[in-house]
């Protein structure tokens, strides 16, 4: 384990830090320039540093769980959990799921009345009894209740002709109910006569494209529990269908652009205001389904199985029957799906803030094991056969109290988790022996808690009226800057640098801004290593016989040397054995010059001196020319012709001599003068 | 003007012990860090010690164990106990004082550890 932490001045905040943090509350386990961050480390550290081990603050994420023997069937258990955690810390419990046998059943058949429906409305008219005894061989107490569904009453939903308003069959003959979105025909009820009675009345309905209005009697069934009649048991909601259905975004065909609400708007048992929301989204409605324990099976024909096939793979305990053409079939449809569906257990929990994390190992009875899955999982399961499922919940931070509640999707039992934070520290302080503080604070964890006008390790420091922005205003470089860098303590207004863990490297300045070992490297070492240099504040001194901005350089001037062994012909300074040249003089050796100025118009009044011993410099040419000195014999150089201070034209060589405006100058004997006109 | 006279040094025998000193002047000294140099005839000179004003301290290896860097802020002086004198720890012994990236060095002491 490890323990990243950043600006930690107390146990709380080594313990949000990390799970590999932990705090010493030794005292005096800091020394002089010590920040009190170093108190804040991975258990061996401490260890390691002298904290003894009934000194290292180091508090555990834990779990305790509570039966409750109170009220009837338990499929769960334990019904509550109070987990205590600690940041980044998880704390794990188990929860069994024992499947009952004869576990209590409301069936809620939701049919589609489209035209297309017609042969299997007339068997499902006969089937109340079927479906009662079908349950009763599963359960004690079952009970059954229908609705209907069509579709939209708008174009293009459905042909909005006053005529095939009243009779929306193609069959004029055919008694036919006008379209609606959702009835709720019958309440659950265990009594089979009125689920005949009730669904004997019902007429079919017709609609004008495929689709169909099917999401949103469901969302209607599962957010009117009242109306439906819906216990707190096994909920199931067999949705008969021969097509598909409208999702959300469909329903702006028919110009209706507000979200649905997924609340309940059953007006004398119709879905009335279906005309004002948008069908629900698949999310939507798999999220209201789940929240209120709802599974529904999808009792669809051959063509369309595909389709909700798709569908149950998104909302979850859910199944797919095929269903025969005319609905002849589904009570042993149903029967199947159920068994599915009970045999597979989903643990799963409400929603959670991003603080928690919340994970599950499945450990299934037939030896299948699913791990760090982000809901439990469980195939196969049979009645009276335990399985169990760790759960594992994780805090980010230092958590509010709070609670959630798990529960197995399908079932009405529930595990109520309540969530604590985990950050305090339990200190042994001799926190009321304030002498330890100067008389001026008192000890939490190691550390001195100052009274108000006292600040300093040991409250050593009065603030004499001056607020801590002030006296920290002194530790700062400028207003941009960090306190002592970043790199200190700001006591009484001064920076007292930490001791560094990097060996060799020691923090000063006044901000302790400097220290000995940023400094640029040479071969892997700074300043290319103690041999060469030394580093002080990001600037390499180097040792004698040794240059460079690491000390990379032996210092040697060989190869600065031009024929005359002078170095960079004095033009220029020997950098690394290499030519800085002074402007415009070109390396290797500062020899030439290409682009300076030429010199001839600077020295013709000394030419005209040292040769002729007039001009403008003829009374003091020695001290007006330093740089020149007159050669006798012609010279190899710049040619120049410049007219003298007489008008007359003067021819002269210069040669350039090592240094900085140094020439050797040759001068014609014969000046070129011009007569002026007679 | 940064100043460093030092003080302390001489001839000793090996085993022995001996202490060295220096002073500085024309700077804020609580803001610096000092160090004790070495120089060996015909070596390069090294790192014996440093101290910041904080008392963070920096040894080199083989002098770790026998030489003690301490510092007075008060006094404005830095001061290098050395013990168990090898005859290796031969040198002129400078004085460093760093005042951010500007170093200035005392003019050196010799000791000498006679075998």
């Known amino acids: 384990q490890e323990c990243t932490k950043f600006k930690v001045s107390s146990c709380r905040e080594c313990i949000e830090s990390g799970p590999g943090c932990t705090w010493c509350q030794k005292l005096n386990f800091t020394g002089p320039g010590d920040p009190d961050s170093i108190r804040c480390d991975t258990r061996p550290q401490l260890l390691m540093r002298g904290c003894a081990a009934d000194d290292i603050m180091d508090p555990t994420s834990l779990a305790e769980t509570q039966e409750d023997h109170n009220g009837g069937q338990k499929q769960l258990s334990p019904q509550k959990v109070t987990l205590y955690l600690r940041p980044g810390q998880a704390a794990a419990f188990n929860v069994t799921f024992r499947r009952a046998k004869g576990y209590p059943i409301d069936l809620y058949y939701l049919m589609d009345l489209s035209y297309s429906m017609l042969d299997d409305l007339r068997n499902v008219k006969k089937l109340g009894g079927d479906l009662l005894r079908a349950l009763n061989e599963i359960t004690e107490s079952g009970r059954i209740g229908f609705g209907s569904f069509v579709d939209k009453t708008v174009l293009p939903f459905v042909n909005t002709h006053p005529d095939k308003l009243r009779n929306p069959c193609p069959n004029k003959e055919k008694e036919c109910q006008p379209p609606f979105a959702f009835r709720h025909v019958l309440k659950l009820t265990n009594n089979s006569n009125q689920f005949q009675t009730e669904v004997g009345k019902q007429l079919i309905s017709g609609n004008l494209d495929a689709p169909e209005g099917g999401l949103d009697a469901m969302m209607q069934v599962a957010a009117c529990p009242e109306e439906i009649g819906w216990r707190n048991v096994t909920r199931l909601l067999v949705f008969a269908t021969d097509d598909g259905f409208h999702f959300a975004g469909d329903g702006k065909l028919g110009a209706i652009l507000t979200p649905n609400d997924g609340r309940c708007h059953l007006e004398d048992n119709l879905y009335k205001r279906s005309n004002e929301f948008d069908y629900p989204s698949v999310g939507q409605l798999a999220h209201k389904l789940a929240e209120n324990n709802i599974q529904p099976i999808f009792a669809v024909t051959s063509r369309m199985v595909k389709t909700y096939e798709k569908l149950t793979e998104i909302i979850p305990k859910s199944a797919v029957g095929e269903l025969s053409e005319d609905s002849s079939n589904v009570v042993h449809l149903i029967k199947n799906a159920y068994n599915k569906l009970s045999s597979r257990v989903f643990l799963d929990h409400n929603a959670l803030p991003d603080t928690l994390k919340v994970t599950y190992d499945s450990f299934c009875s037939n030896g299948v094991t699913h791990r760090n899955q982000p809901r439990g999982d469980c195939d196969g399961v049979q009645i009276n056969v335990p399985i169990t499922f760790q759960v594992k919940v994780t805090a980010t931070e230092c958590i509010q109290e709070q609670s959630f509640v798990i529960r197995a999707l399908g079932f009405t039992d529930i595990v109520t988790v309540q969530v604590l934070p985990q950050c305090e520290c339990r200190c042994r302080d001799q926190s009321r022996d304030r002498s330890l503080c100067h008389g001026k604070g008192f000890l939490e964890c190691g550390i001195c808690r100052c009274d108000t006008g006292y600040i300093g390790k040991n409250c050593e420091c009065q603030t004499q009226g001056r607020s801590s922005q002030e006296l920290e205003g002194s530790c700062r470089k400028d207003n941009n800057s960090i306190i002592c860098s970043g790199l200190g303590d700001c006591v009484c207004g001064q920076c007292l640098c930490h001791t560094s863990d990097v060996p060799g490297k020691l923090i000063y300045g006044q901000y302790c801004e400097c220290d000995t070992i940023n400094c640029e490297r040479y071969n892997g070492q700074v300043c290319g290593g103690p041999g060469r240099g030394l580093c002080f504040c990001g600037k390499c001194r180097c040792h004698p016989g040794f240059e460079g901005s690491a000390c990379q350089c032996e210092r040697t001037t060989e190869g600065c040397l031009n024929p005359r062994r002078v170095e960079c012909s004095g033009r220029g300074r020997c950098r690394c054995n290499v030519c800085e040249c002074h402007s415009g003089y070109q390396l290797p050796l500062c020899q030439e010059c290409p682009g300076c100025p030429s010199p001839c118009g600077k020295y013709i009044s000394c030419a005209e001196c040292l040769k002729f011993e007039k001009g403008p410099f003829g009374k003091n040419c020695s001290a007006a020319c330093p740089g020149l000195q007159l050669s006798n014999n012609p010279v190899k150089g710049r040619t120049c012709k410049e007219r003298d201070s007489e008008g007359c034209w003067v021819a002269y060589t210069l040669e350039q001599q090592d240094g900085m405006d140094r020439y050797l100058i040759y001068v014609d004997e014969s000046r070129e003068c011009v007569a002026g006109p007679n | 003007e940064v100043q460093l006279v030092e003080s302390g040094g001489g001839l000793v025998q090996a085993g022995g012990s001996v202490r060295l000193s220096c002073a500085a002047s024309?700077?804020?000294?609580?803001?610096?860090?000092m160090g004790w140099y070495r120089q060996a005839p015909g070596k390069q000179r090294e790192l014996v010690a440093q101290?910041?004003?904080?008392?963070?301290?920096n040894y080199a290896d083989s002098v770790k164990g026998r030489f003690t860097i301490s510092r007075d802020n008060a006094k404005k002086t830095v001061d290098l106990q050395m013990n168990s004198l090898k005859p290796e720890d031969t040198a002129v012994y400078y004085c460093?004082?760093?005042?951010?990236?500007?170093?200035?060095w005392g003019q050196g002491t010799q000791v000498t550890v006679s075998s």
């Open positions: 101290i910041t004003s904080s008392d963070a301290t």
């Open positions: 024309g700077v804020i000294f609580r803001f610096v860090l």
């Open positions: 460093l004082l760093a005042r951010g990236p500007d170093v200035y």
